[in-house]
């Protein structure tokens, strides 16, 4: 939006569409240019000309803050924003008032105004900035500090989130996030954010507030994890009934409503968007939680945030699946298709929930710890921080447990104590306002192009260098994945979610290396879980030399900015169920395939599930629909008429450059999963 008093006068413009949506923890450049048709203004023959004066402000419902003022080449920055905002092009380009903001936090959302004054002329332009995303702490259900790096990433992915970056945790800390629990971050470091240092939480910063770090850790060490949920297309809703629901009934009720049980990440995003519900409900990971965005004593102990109901008084364990709560459902276009058994049955290992320790109760830790604070022994709850300035952290305040107005939540233990869904410390609760294969098969007459993804199962090769802390996962499969639309179209976050949607996780460098050593080759750059971009080349050729010239090996572009776009390498472990091939005379459109699988108490198989089935021996020379709208077929025994001379999962593309999904109305076979 731009304004000026009249034509032929000073005019200011911000050439960006509003609102501008940016990720928590990222940097932002807001371009602002002004045209000043006036000659230098002088007040009298003897005085020097007046220079234009630039002022940047941020406007929110509550207040207006001046960020900086610049004139005559001098820039004065509000001390609270000293290392945060700058004018990168001024005074080198005097008419360029572009603003740069570092390490965006939720509190940085608002309307940004670029105002230029020259003499009596005054003009301004505004842009709304929305900082997206929320960081939350997440813990394996059974006890504290049980996630190695790989499972930490999985835990986030299972909850519609990805593992947070250090920048995102720093931004959340600046927003008021405080958590005395060491958690993995995307760069393989382990950190935790502390505003009011105390014994047990000093870390490497002694008595200074800040994000504590243990540096880069071995990937098989175990901690909690900090996850980052970006945004959701759909909506979270609560469902109830007079008797409430068991976990299974809750899942069924959501399905009946055309929805699914929500994930923890989706609930956090809903909470961030203002959702407030004083009633606990089941989530997809079998945790029981409720979102509080209006503090009140009888509902979450006067604290804001997503509250969790625990089985045990030390805040571990999840309620018995037969206990009764509401159902928290998620409905929308961006369903992440989580199989029923994705979180395991009965076993607690992969069932993860966000949690914190009970005040004044020390949890048993997984191994001998010499420095108490390295594991944040005791956690006290803190008062929500509403507008935390960089210099004034809020004091902490212990909290009294108050039961819910309705029925209490009972522990499923012999002790007969009562659990109230509160008593955890704030977790991000500050400032919410915080086809056709190559052989001729019956099918439509369109030209399809088949890719040769040579996929190998990942097993340890004799003599292969083992990577410390990264146990090999025998029997898993690494595969290259790209959405049908185009090559190199996935940001780092989209890449992780693409793997998750396909029933897999993003591969680690070690997994890709093991696949390469077993003969895997793919001349396509793809994201890996450490935010590097790599591709494996066994037989170097001109477009695929990368950083290795004519030597074979895994090529790497190093760590890339997460906004860059590539394909992705995914990893799928074992198949929890079976993939089966379905055909009929008239074959199926994509929609018919979906309906057919569902009518057989199954779902359309995902790409990851097909890869896992291929590894287990599924061999079909007929392309079938998969859940992402792609058309693929698994070849275990290569034959000339069927997918070339190597085993692998073949993909049918629309275009010869190996992009494009088949028309959903075209007819093909089907792969279902049950």
């Amino acid at each position: 939006e731009e304004t000026s008093d009249h034509d032929n006068s000073l005019s200011v413009s911000i050439p960006e569409p509003s609102p501008m949506r940016v990720l928590l923890g990222s940097s932002l450049t807001i371009p602002c240019y002004f045209i000043d048709p006036m000659h230098p203004v002088t007040t009298a023959p003897s005085t020097a000309p007046l220079a234009p004066r630039i002022k940047w402000s941020r406007i929110t419902k509550e207040k207006e803050v001046v960020l900086l003022v610049a004139t005559e080449g001098q820039v004065r920055i509000n001390s609270a924003y000293q290392d945060k905002v700058s004018l990168p092009n001024y005074p080198a380009i005097p008419s360029d008032a572009t603003l740069e903001i570092q390490n965006l936090r939720s509190n940085d959302s608002g309307i940004y105004r670029c105002e230029v004054m020259h003499g009596i002329e005054d003009s301004e332009a505004t842009l709304e900035v929305v900082v997206k995303g929320i960081v939350f702490h997440y813990r394996a259900i059974s006890t504290r500090y049980t996630l190695d790096f790989d499972r930490a990433q999985r835990a986030c992915l299972q909850n519609s989130a990805i593992i947070a970056t250090p920048e995102q945790l720093q931004a959340a800390y600046e927003d008021g996030f405080h958590q005395c629990d060491a958690g993995w971050l995307a760069d393989q470091t382990v950190r935790y954010p502390i505003h009011t240092p105390r014994e047990g939480c000093y870390g490497d910063k002694d008595e200074f507030p800040g994000v504590r770090t243990y540096g880069i850790r071995d990937t098989n060490e175990t901690y909690d994890v900090y996850c980052f949920a970006e945004e959701m297309e759909g909506e979270v809703l609560y469902a109830t009934s007079p008797e409430k629901f068991t976990f299974q009934e809750a899942a069924n009720e959501c399905r009946r409503l055309g929805a699914r049980l929500a994930t923890t990440g989706q609930l956090y995003l809903a909470w961030q968007g203002g959702m407030d519900m004083c009633s606990a409900g089941w989530l997809a990971d079998r945790s029981v939680r409720y979102p509080i965005s209006k503090a009140r004593p009888n509902c979450g102990g006067n604290l804001l945030g997503v509250r969790t109901v625990y089985l045990h008084a030390n805040q571990t364990g999840y309620p018995d699946p037969s206990s009764r709560y509401d159902a928290i459902c998620y409905t929308g276009e961006d369903f992440v298709d989580i199989p029923e058994n994705f979180f395991g049955v009965g076993g607690e290992e992969d069932i993860t929930i966000q949690t914190v320790t009970w005040p004044d109760v020390e949890l048993p830790l997984p191994r001998n710890i010499t420095e108490g604070e390295a594991r944040g022994n005791v956690i006290l709850t803190v008062k929500p921080i509403f507008d935390l300035s960089p210099t004034a952290p809020e004091p902490e305040e212990p909290f009294t447990f108050v039961p819910e107005p309705e029925k209490p939540f009972t522990f499923a233990t012999d002790v007969g104590v009562t659990a109230f869904p509160e008593a955890e410390n704030r977790t991000g609760e500050a400032t919410r306002p915080w086809g056709v294969p190559e052989e001729s098969t019956p099918g439509p007459a369109f030209t399809a192009f088949t890719s040769e993804d040579h996929v190998v199962q990942v097993t340890a090769v004799p003599g292969a260098a083992e990577v410390p802390g990264q146990p090999r996962l025998p029997g898993g499969v690494v595969f290259h994945y790209r959405p049908g639309s185009a090559r190199y179209s996935l940001t780092f976050e989209e890449a992780q979610q693409a793997c998750l949607r396909t029933g897999a996780v993003i591969a680690s460098p070690e997994q890709l290396q093991a696949a390469y050593e077993a003969g895997y080759e793919q001349c396509d750059a793809g994201w890996l879980q450490d935010q590097t971009v790599r591709y494996p080349i066994v037989s170097p050729r001109t477009p695929c030399v990368g950083d290795k010239d004519s030597s074979p090996g895994v090529r790497t572009y190093g760590v890339r900015p997460p906004s860059e776009t590539y394909d992705v390498y995914c990893y799928v472990d074992k198949l929890e169920g079976e993939v089966f091939f379905i055909t009929r005379l008239e074959q199926f459109t994509f929609q018919e395939a979906l309906a057919f699988c569902e009518s057989h108490n199954a779902t359309l198989a995902s790409t990851g599930q097909l890869y896992a089935a291929w590894r287990q021996g599924l061999d079909k020379c007929y392309a079938g629909w998969l859940s992402d709208g792609s058309l693929r077929y698994p070849i275990v025994t290569p034959r000339p008429s069927c997918g070339g001379d190597k085993p692998g999962v073949r993909t049918v593309y629309l275009y010869p450059n190996q992009t494009g999904l088949p028309d959903p109305l075209s007819r093909h076979h089907v792969f279902c999963f049950r």
């Epitope: 909506e235 979270v236 609560y238 469902a239 519900m277 009633s279 509902c299 107005p405």
Partner: nanobody, 124 residues
Framework: EVQLVESGGGLVQAGGSLRLSCAAS????????MGWFRQAPGKEREFVSI????????VYADSVKGRFTISRDNAKNTVYLQMNSLKPEDTAIYYC?????????????????WGQGTQVTVSS
Amino acid sequence: EVQLVESGGGLVQAGGSLRLSCAASGRSFSSYAMGWFRQAPGKEREFVSIISWSGGSTVYADSVKGRFTISRDNAKNTVYLQMNSLKPEDTAIYYCAAGRLYRATPRPADFGSWGQGTQVTVSS
């Protein structure tokens, strides 16, 4: 399902107040989210407010925030809508509704039971 009967509507001057009541008969009132919707002549039915089954959580349409308050008394099987600082644009038929869903943006389809409505007219 529950049966719903609204009362308390009428004619009031701009700036005035009214309190609408909705009495429910039938079983398990306390397991229903209760909502108020309104429909002005020639317009679609629009959401006004919702209260959760426990009464602990509420949502309001932006147009009524700060002026209207929803509450419920589960012992009396009744939900209330206190309307203050009324404006001519609040003129409509107000409907009470009961449903098993609760979300930030309630929609009529979330509610399985509806009252007959009560007329509210705000004169300037």
